[in-house]
């Protein structure tokens, strides 16, 4: 167990950035930094947690942007980002900080946030060691800070994997330094063969002395490069103390990406060209010349291997690569129950029966906004709407001239005349009424109830 | 680590076709774009053709209408269909492989193609 721990000394325009802060004044704003730790040696999915721990800093003092003042280093947060781990330290990870900017201006639903700068970087890194510095570039900013991974006792070592217990007894396993710096606070440990390596030595019966890796020699002094048997490598054979013929860790040159190797005891080092990482080089930066934004996104920054990108989508597309297009049908924007259709250059809408309108908008069975022409009424009914029609109009919409006479309303062979205001029918002799329709008894009553006044039969009857 | 294969390279006639291989294996995850760059003799590598594990691709102006890119997310694999193969295309072509959202890729040995005849 033990505590890495981030301390941020700057953010700000990098040398040759811009001259003016990228982000146009939009009212006060703070910064915070987020920090994610992984084992460095697992590819990992950037969706996955941050297996080895992350943390979020407090918010530096608020800061109002001039746009037209050189944007300087920005207010940081106060105090360390601390990053607790619970096993092993892995000795090699990859670190990634994100520079967060909160606007505090009057946004609806309370702050908005964006991501002003994001680093990824794999480092080794020996817990108990002192303070790494590192300077790191994204787009126009520059970040400065340093870090170190400390362990939390019991626990120590460059790993934190021993334990020094009181009142236990304190062994140091196989590869990992005796516990002689941390004595204080751990039991004796056993008495190892006079005058073996406390460094490069350990034991875990009294009296024997065994070498880490790396050395060699009843005492743990000789250095495996360097040993008397004509630097051959390999395990030590048990019959002469020399090492066995064995493959050096540079041979064959295990960095990829033309980057250089060094022995180091025991193992090897990769001296990586700029743009490469990992144990072996063998891990690259990501830049806008990889064409990471589809779909015409336009990437930006990102110029060099030091420095995150960023994809500004086109319209219609979404993800930090503009990978996804936006379905815009989730919006539900065709209305009255409107089949969407997304064609990518646009958004068609097709509307069920009775309606219409880009959006199906418009009720066609619906009086509201109807017009009936030539003084006709219109009527709902059953979902749907119809025009009563003035007398002499007819049609949907009542534009049409109609005929009276045309559907021959009069009965029993009466004749038919058209009149400005509807049609009159001229009874033939035994009928009377409105189209001719009640026939006249022979004693002379009609056949209705009772006749209006004045109305004999064989009179012109008017429609009305 | 991820590990990156090619294969497919060689020697063909102008107005031929070739078709490239690269199969990934190692700690691949969901979300990644694999594509092909190339590097001809005394210029800098250029990106020929990318593909989002979700199906977005890119292609270099120079190729459009003639490569074709394609892959198999199950298989960890990406193809290049080149066609109508010009003299121009020679180059050493590069598999590049990297996570979204994790700036960090991995690159391939490179396979020679070379249009002559």
């Known amino acids: 167990a033990g505590v890495f721990e981030l301390q941020i000394h700057s953010f700000g325009p990098g040398p040759g950035g811009a001259p003016r802060s990228p982000y146009s004044a939009r009212g006060p704003c703070r910064l915070f930094f987020r920090v994610c730790l992984k084992p460095g040696l697992s590819e990992e999915a950037a969706e996955s947690p941050c297996a080895l721990g992350a943390a979020l800093s407090a918010r530096g003092p608020v800061y109002t942007e001039q746009p037209e003042a050189p944007a300087p280093d920005l207010p940081l947060p106060n105090g360390l980002l601390q990053v607790p781990f619970r096993d092993a330290w892995p000795g090699t990870f990859s670190l990634i900080i994100e520079t967060w900017r909160e606007e505090l201006g009057d946004q609806i639903g309370g702050p908005a946030w964006s991501l002003l700068a994001r680093v990824t970087r794999r480092r080794r890194l020996a817990a108990g060691g002192p303070w790494a510095g590192d300077i790191q570039r994204a787009g126009a900013w520059e970040l400065r800070f340093s870090y170190r991974a400390r362990c939390e006792l019991p626990a120590v070592g460059t790993a934190c994997t021993r334990l020094c217990r009181p009142r236990s007894a304190s062994r140091c396993g196989p590869g990992l330094r005796p516990c002689a710096p941390l004595e204080d606070e751990c039991e004796a440990p056993p008495v190892c063969r006079a005058g073996c390596s406390l460094e490069h030595g350990f034991c875990e019966q009294p009296g024997e002395c065994r070498c880490l890796e790396g050395w060699t020699g009843p005492l743990c002094m000789v250095p495996v490069s360097t040993s008397s048997c004509l630097g051959l490598r390999g395990p030590s054979s048990t019959t002469t103390g020399c090492l066995v013929p064995g493959p050096g860790p540079c041979d064959g040159n295990p960095c990829a990406n033309g980057g250089s190797c060094s022995e180091t005891p025991g193992s090897f080092e990769c001296t990586c060209p700029r743009g490469f990482y990992g144990l072996r080089c063998e891990v690259s930066g990501v830049t806008c010349a990889d064409g990471p934004c589809f779909n015409g996104g336009l990437c930006v920054g990102g110029a060099d291997p030091d420095s995150a990108y960023i994809c500004h989508c086109p319209p219609g597309f979404q993800g930090s690569n503009c990978e996804k297009r936006v379905d815009r049908c989730s919006l539900q924007p065709c209305r009255n129950g409107g089949l969407c259709l997304d064609l990518g250059h646009a958004l068609r809408c097709r509307c069920r029966a009775g309606f219409a309108g880009p959006r199906c908008e418009h009720d066609l069975n619906d009086c509201a906004g109807r017009a009936c022409a030539n003084g006709g009424t219109c009527v709902e009914g059953g979902g749907a709407h119809r025009c009563s029609c003035a007398l002499g109009f007819g049609g949907r919409d009542c534009r049409e001239r109609a005929d009276p006479c045309a559907a021959r309303p009069c009965a029993h062979g009466g004749r038919c005349y058209a009149h400005f205001s509807g049609l009159v029918c001229a009874c033939a002799p035994g009928y009377m009424g409105a189209r001719c329709e009640f026939p006249v008894h022979p004693d002379g009553v009609s056949a209705l109830p009772a006749a209006p006044p004045g109305l004999r039969p064989g009179d012109p009857q008017r429609y009305p | 680590e991820v590990q990156l294969v090619e294969s497919g390279g060689g020697l063909v006639q102008p107005g031929g076709s070739l078709t490239l291989s690269c199969a990934a294996s190692g700690s691949t995850f969901t979300s990644n774009v694999m594509g092909w760059h190339r590097q001809a003799p005394g210029k800098q590598r250029e990106l020929v053709a990318n593909?989002?594990?979700?199906?977005?691709?890119n292609y270099a102006d120079s190729v459009k209408g003639r490569f074709t890119i394609s892959r198999d997310n199950a298989k960890n694999s990406v193809y290049l269909q080149m066609n109508s193969l010009r003299a121009e295309d020679t180059a050493v072509y590069y598999c590049?492989?990297?996570?979204?959202?994790?700036?960090?890729?991995?690159w391939g040995q490179g396979t020679l193609v070379t249009v002559s005849s």
């Open positions: 593909m989002h594990s979700g199906g977005s691709t």
């Open positions: 590049r492989w990297y996570g979204i959202q994790r700036a960090e890729g991995y």
